[in-house]
């Protein structure tokens, strides 16, 4: 278990021409809030698919009124972090969607109007317990700067929050074969209680004797990679997964990555993602300081004056990895809209637009929205030769004239009540039930039927759906 934390640093106009108009005005002051949605793996799922790792909504930012004639500055932000608790292992690879919402504070009776200003998405590798990772994402003419990290909740530790720490039984040292739990030096790593042979890299357990697999791995000991290719094996598809089992040993079997590196398959071989202080094909080179020049591709090395202290590589645009060793395939994120062709020039991305589209990301349809109106605070989105409305929360249809009722499908189980709150669907559970959709009965002794309740979740707790 642990928490993914997101800190928004700024939201404002991006560099370059075509600065966006301020979203607020003296006539219509507004404030911002943010929504983050996390999904495990490097999935390219639609924005509407479930936030399987979790989601969070920020507080509202300060009210902002545009100064007439002034360009849009960085807009005032809500205080605090967005926190997304996760109950199981941290998957290591994840996809995110961060949405910037505008709340208009006009004098409309019955409350404000909400509209989506910008949505950014990405796919990242991240080890739990590591430092804050900084990121910049652009959506149209807007730029969002943010940092994120994943941290484990005690007693969990490790890059996937699957190792456990326990207080020391003796004051001086840990038991045989057990290491101190950095950074909790007064605690010791708990003995492994998983099923014998359970892969330490790809499996984890929450109860003694079990072996649960991280995404991409299967088999009783989580040693078999799941292939996403079509099933050519005579064994056919595995009933345990939606993919297929690759017969025989995979390139990552036995984990060829040394020094705690994690292995991932590539089409022809494998790739090791090394912890700080190690590099090389199999993370076998160690004791590195900045004097050794560990940062590739023009990365800037910081810290690490002696072999015992870690160095950090600050990578130039287009490169990533703990040693800036990996070229970012920025075109894989499909930044060019409306069928534009993506060209990664190394120093910059270029989009070659189809006829009828323009803009750095081919986001402008040259005349789709001319004279079009979206009702109820919706905004017109150009694309595909026909205008489309991005509707405010609670509205739907081609022109946002239809009221959308997220409760129509009766999502709250066991007699729970569903409310169409502006922040998303809300369930109020009937007595005796709990959970996001009131799906878990509360046992008479007060325990729930959940395998393990997430931190802070009590019987009768509501859950918000975003």
């Amino acid at each position: 278990a642990g928490v993914f934390e997101l800190q928004i640093h700024s939201f404002g106009p991006g560099p370059g021409p075509g600065a966006p108009r301020s979203p607020c005005s003296a006539r219509l002051p507004c404030r911002l809030f943010f929504r983050v949605c996390l999904k495990p793996g490097l999935s390219e799922e639609a924005a509407e698919s479930p936030c399987a790792l979790g989601a969070a909504l920020s507080a509202r930012g300060p009210v902002y009124t545009e100064q007439p004639g002034a360009p849009a500055p960085d807009l005032p932000l809500p205080d605090g972090l967005l926190q997304v608790p996760f109950r199981d292992a941290w998957p290591g690879t994840f996809s995110f969607i961060i949405e910037t919402w505008r709340e208009e504070l006009g004098d409309q009776i019955g409350g404000p109007a909400w509209s989506l200003l910008a949505r950014v998405a990405g796919r990242r590798r991240l080890a739990a317990g590591g430092p804050w990772a900084r990121d910049i994402q652009r959506a149209g003419a807007w730029e969002l700067r943010f940092s994120y990290r994943a941290r484990c909740e005690p007693p969990a530790v490790g890059t996937a929050c699957t190792r456990l720490c326990r207080p020391r039984s003796a004051p001086s040292r840990c038991g045989p074969g057990l290491r101190p739990c950095a950074p909790l030096e007064d605690e010791c790593e708990a003995p492994l209680v998983c099923r014998a042979g359970c892969s330490p890299e790809h499996g984890f357990c929450e109860q003694p004797g079990e072996c649960r697999c991280l995404e991409g791995w299967t088999g009783p000991l989580c040693t078999v990679p799941v292939s996403t290719s079509s099933c050519l094996s005579p064994r056919g598809p595995s009933s345990a997964t939606t993919g297929c089992l690759v017969p025989g040993p995979g390139p990552c079997d036995g984990n060829p990555c040394a020094n705690g590196g994690s292995c991932s398959e590539t089409p022809r071989s494998f790739e090791c993602t090394c912890p700080r202080g190690f590099y090389g094909l199999r993370c076998e080179v160690s004791g590195v300081t900045c004097a050794d020049g560990p940062c590739f591709n023009g990365g800037l090395c910081v810290g690490g004056a002696d072999p015992d202290s870690a160095y950090i590589c600050h990578c130039p645009p287009g490169f990533q990895g703990s040693n800036c060793e990996k070229r970012v395939d920025r075109c894989s994120l499909q930044p060019c809209r409306n069928g534009g062709l993506c060209l990664d020039l190394g120093h910059a991305l270029r989009c070659r637009c189809r006829a009828g589209f323009a803009g750095p990301r081919c986001e402008h349809d040259l005349d789709d929205c001319a004279g079009r109106a979206c009702a109820n605070g919706g905004t017109c989105v150009e694309g595909g030769g026909a205008h489309r409305c991005s509707c405010a929360l609670g509205f739907g249809g081609r022109d946002c004239r239809e009221r959308a009722d997220p409760c129509a499908a009766r999502p709250c189980a066991h007699g729970g009540r569903c409310y169409a709150h502006f922040s998303g669907l809300v369930c109020a559970c009937a007595p005796g039930y709990m959970g996001a959709r009131c799906e878990f009965p509360v046992h008479p002794d007060g325990a729930s039927a959940l395998p393990a309740a997430p931190p802070g979740l009590r019987p009768g707790d509501p859950q918000r759906y975003l």
Partner: antibody
Framework: QVQLKESGPALVKPTQTLTLTCTFS?????????MGWVRQAPGQGLEWMGT????????DYASWAKGRVTITADESTSTAYMELSSLRSEDTAVYYC???????????WGQGTLVTVSS | DIQLTQSPSFLSASVGDRVTITCQST????????LSWYQQKPGQPPKLLIY???NLEIGVPSRFSGSGSGTDFTLTINSLEAEDAATYYC??????????FGGGTKVEIK
């Protein structure tokens, strides 16, 4: 624009039944929320009477109101009703209808209607 | 029956003062934070200030803030202004779809 408006008799006699109407505009009964009735005796605090949940038209009442209060709603006319039987002078109050769309708070209120119970 | 007790029931303070009103429930509110605060002036319906214990309603000045969870909650007015003279009510929502209001706190400007 979204609003609620209560209406009903200003004066009723003891032992009679009071029927109040709450008409709303700018939103539909077909979406899911609670329509509640709250009253306030002169110089006193707010007192919850009961609610109707528009998702399934189930009702909940304050313990003192069970058996005396009946809340109903009619989607076709965008109206909610509250009946209070066996009136006594202590029922003299301003009666409000209010809406909850989640997290248990009333974000939208009517202006209220004063009902006096007197012979 | 569930009781919500507000204290004090009356307070007099000067413009610029920091004012704190507490609300104590005999039962934990649903979800531990389904508690709201309202302001009411004579002849007007209540106006929502805070929902879900600490969320400021749109258009409400930032000098108002709420905190607390479970059974104990607080409304704070950071720098009292003349227009804040009113009666303030807390209201909880409870398992079983039950609502309850506190008795109210009348705030007067000295």
């Amino acid at each position: 624009q979204v609003q609620l408006k209560e209406s009903g008799p200003a004066l009723v006699k003891p032992t009679q039944t009071l029927t109040l109407t709450c008409t709303f505009s700018g939103f539909s009964l077909s979406s899911s929320y609670d329509m509640g009735w709250v009253r306030q005796a002169p110089g006193q605090g707010l007192e919850w009477m009961g609610t109707i949940y528009t998702g399934d038209y189930s009702t909940d009442y304050a313990s003192w109101a069970k058996g005396r209060v009946t809340i109903t709603a009619d989607e076709s006319t965008s109206t909610a009703y509250m009946e209070l039987s066996s009136l006594r002078s202590e029922d003299t109050a301003v009666y409000y209808c209010a809406r909850n769309t989640g997290y248990g708070y009333f974000g939208l209120w009517g202006q209220g209607t004063l009902v006096t119970v007197s012979s | 029956d569930i009781q919500l007790t507000q204290s004090p029931s009356f307070l007099s303070a000067s413009v610029g003062d920091r004012v704190t009103i507490t609300c104590q429930s005999t039962e934990s509110v649903y979800g531990s934070d389904w508690l709201s605060w309202y302001q009411q002036k004579p002849g007007q319906p209540p106006k929502l200030l805070i929902y879900q214990a600490s969320n400021l309603e749109i258009g409400v000045p930032s000098r108002f803030s709420g905190s607390g969870s479970g059974t104990d909650f607080t409304l704070t007015i950071n720098s009292l202004e003349a227009e804040d003279a009113a009666t303030y009510y807390c209201q909880g929502y409870y398992s079983g779809y039950i609502y309850a209001f506190g008795g109210g706190t009348k705030v007067e400007i000295k």
